[in-house]
Amino acid sequence: LVPHLGDREKRDSVCPQGKYIHPQNNSICCTKCHKGTYLYNDCPGPGQDTDCRECESGSFTASENHLRHCLSCSKCRKEMGQVEISSCTVDRDTVCGCRKNQYRHYWSENLFQCFNCSLCLNGTVHLSCQEKQNTVCTCHAGFFLRENECVSCSNCKKSLECTKLCLPQIENVKGTEDSGTT
């Protein structure tokens, strides 16, 4: 099955690459605007220049286009711990990231939060912290992994998933509790 093309894609596909169909005259192909600029006026006729203007401060276009307006620059979200890696230019959006020893957790496609990388106290680093993934820890004996921290088996309740890992410790605690003095 041929994928359904939107009106704009249909119009563009009639013209060679780097050009678009004039919205009022489908016999004219106008040259697209370069990145960093936007469409101010369509070309008046074949072989004539498209009127492109540079994006104003606080806006950008990252690829050739025939947009009537530049796109607004993104802002890094301080409340999510984000910091600016590189500022917005006319042809590139702001790049946001995290500080050193932090990783990004994406809550959705266009929203991430910065969290501190786990240090694996009472365990060893199985996989180092990466840009989009926390450290993977392996816990020492007598400890189990909870919320990516190695927690003492003394904090393991019977109802939790830690029971298999902490089974010897739980039995010991149970034995100690059960052994009454007569």
Epitope: K75, H105, Q113, F115, N134
Partner: nanobody, 119 residues
């Protein structure tokens, strides 16, 4: 003890509106970023919106942008979600929560209020 209590859910027809509230206590509300998340039947948690302490520059998921408005009243320790142009896909349990700090899980969130959009 942190407490978050949502209200305002109910049955509404497609295209209708609802206003959810979340009464907060047990922490300094005015210092915290607050979040609305939702869970549709048989689906995972979806981040709907969040609002920083000063109420400026809230975030909206693409699925609700232009239809939902998050707001807060720091003097009343209350978070709101105004939902307009509701559709069947908005049917879910809506929870308010404190923005996580230690890791990508919610330490503090409410029991939720059910929103059902149906004719």
């Amino acid at each position: 003890e942190v407490q978050l209590l949502e209200s305002g859910g109910g049955l509404v027809q497609p295209g209708g509106s609802l206003r959810l509230s979340c009464a907060a206590s047990g922490f300094t509300f005015a210092h915290e970023t607050m979040v609305w998340v939702r869970q549709a039947p048989g689906k995972g948690l979806e981040w709907v919106s969040h609002i920083p302490p000063d109420g400026q520059d809230p975030f909206y998921a693409d699925s609700v942008k232009g239809r939902f408005t998050i707001s807060r009243d720091n003097s009343k320790n209350t978070l709101y979600l105004q939902m307009n142009s509701l559709a069947a896909e908005d049917t879910a349990v809506y929870h308010c929560a404190l923005l996580p700090k230690r890791g990508p899980w919610f330490d503090y969130w409410g029991q939720g209020t059910l929103v059902t959009v149906s004719s």
